[in-house]
Interface confidence: low
């Protein structure tokens, strides 16, 4: 198809050679087509434009992306030729940085339903280059953590070395949606919730005497809890004595709750005390029975094939430990009467 009628946008991706980072292109179809086509969920029924040139399907992935080879060859379908580029709805994700991503990318609707649609396309000229500015050694990461329940901020990596005063106006997107109120190089979050997690994109415009282009960076934001300050607690067994029947098999379960730690090396084991002797028991593997953002519950059982008289004189001790400290719970077996 003829791409001479496509609207054109120039973008710059300056990537850090020290870190892994991703990049995205949005299919910025001209209004009102874009509203109808890619971001329909932003419109209430009353806001639907009267004239919609694109009458394609409601499928949000209904755009086609191409790359224009620099040698003038025909346009190439992105999905067939570029495994490191993934299309998600109206967004093109570049999974790996590198100057070989430089080039012209064209998006347009898959379904051409009217003469208007032919000229409905966007050509994005992407320039990719490694970061050379050594003066900004501590630029913000493309992976940023927000601590749940606290105040935090998300910084635009390409602008993080500039003060707020000298920073240009920034356009922010979260998971492909425009954050219209954010215009600074830093988003301040008063209280962090899990919904703040996602893929953020920050854009600003740079110009010279000849032309202007958009500088874009992508930030993956995760919400995390702080490392626990508590040693693990044993949820089961609660009682320190257990009634048993002699000669019968017995399973005693130890369940412990471990708070979140980034470096997580939980220990849960059983050992037996018999007068002055103490030894660790070889028991089945521990298993995680519940895992949440804040903590993990791990269980480990001790199995006695047959309870003997000798077992009644022993103490069975569950020992749990994390980087903060350890906790134990001992159980004495008592013969069931009657």
């Amino acid at each position: 198809f003829n791409i001479s009628g496509c609207s054109t946008k120039k973008l710059l991706w300056t990537y850090s050679t020290r870190s892994e980072e991703e990049f995205v292109l949005f299919c910025d179809l001209p209004e009102p087509q874009k509203s109808h086509f890619c971001h329909r969920n932003r419109l209430s029924p009353k806001q639907v434009p009267e004239h919609l040139p694109f009458m394609g399907s409601n499928d949000l992935s209904d755009v086609q992306w191409y790359q224009q080879p620099s040698n003038g060859d025909p346009l190439e379908d992105i999905r067939k030729s570029y495994p490191h580029i993934i299309q998600d709805k109206c967004t093109l994700h570049f999974l790996t940085p590198g100057v070989n991503n430089s080039g012209s990318y064209i998006c347009r609707p898959k379904m051409i339903k009217s003469p208007y649609d032919v000229a409905c396309c966007v050509k994005m000229i992407l320039e990719v280059k490694p970061q050379t500015n050594a003066s900004c050694e501590y630029s913000a990461s493309h992976k940023q953590d927000l601590l749940l329940g606290s105040t935090g901020s998300i910084s635009c990596p390409s602008l993080s070395c500039q003060s707020d005063a000298q920073s240009p106006a920034v356009t922010w997107y979260k998971n492909g949606k425009l954050l219209s109120v954010e215009r600074s190089n830093r988003i301040v979050v008063d209280e962090v919730y899990d919904y703040h997690q996602g893929t953020y994109v920050c854009d600003y415009t740079q110009s010279d005497t000849v032309s202007s282009w958009t500088v874009r960076a992508v930030v993956q934001v995760r919400t995390i809890v702080g490392d626990t300050k508590l040693k693990p607690d044993i949820l089961d067994p609660v009682e320190d004595t257990l009634e048993v029947e002699l000669g019968k098999p017995l399973t005693i379960s130890c369940k412990a709750r471990f708070g979140f730690e980034r470096v997580f090396n939980p220990v849960i084991k059983w050992y037996i005390k018999d007068s002055d002797l103490e030894w660790e028991v070889s028991v089945p593997e521990a298993k995680s029975i519940k895992s949440t953002l804040k903590d993990e519950i791990i269980e480990r059982n001790i199995i006695l094939e047959k309870v003997t008289q000798r077992d009644l004189r022993r103490k069975f001790v569950c020992f749990v430990q994390n980087s903060i400290g350890n906790t134990t719970q001992s159980v004495q077996l008592k013969e069931k009467r009657g």
Epitope: S19, E20, P83, H84, T96, K143, R222
Partner: nanobody, 124 residues
Framework: DVQLQESGGGLVQAGGSLRLSCAAS????????MGWFRQAPGMVREFVAA????????YYADSVQGRFTISRDNAKNTVYLQMNSLKPEDTAVYYC?????????????????WGQGTQVTVSS
Amino acid sequence: DVQLQESGGGLVQAGGSLRLSCAASGRTFSSYAMGWFRQAPGMVREFVAAISWSGGSTYYADSVQGRFTISRDNAKNTVYLQMNSLKPEDTAVYYCAADRSLSGSYFGATIDYWGQGTQVTVSS
């Protein structure tokens, strides 16, 4: 989808060496950061080492730093873990993993694909 198949595990004496391999099927292998985790009896799965999509960045758990080396060959769709100066506490099932995002603290938070695991036993 990416399928991962580990090999190279076995029984070795303390102080010895082993080289684990993880063969990946799928065209997009080179887009993924790759890593190794291990699970010893009675413990939960723990991070061992990871390597970025390009091989330019590597990350190691403190317990294996200086003894283990992770590498990858994108042409062969394979990631390797060279384990030297093995200790009895390295005994575990070793799992290969693939993830689209990688920085040291994230790898393992949301793993896209896991292998089935290979047993490594270090005797004293």
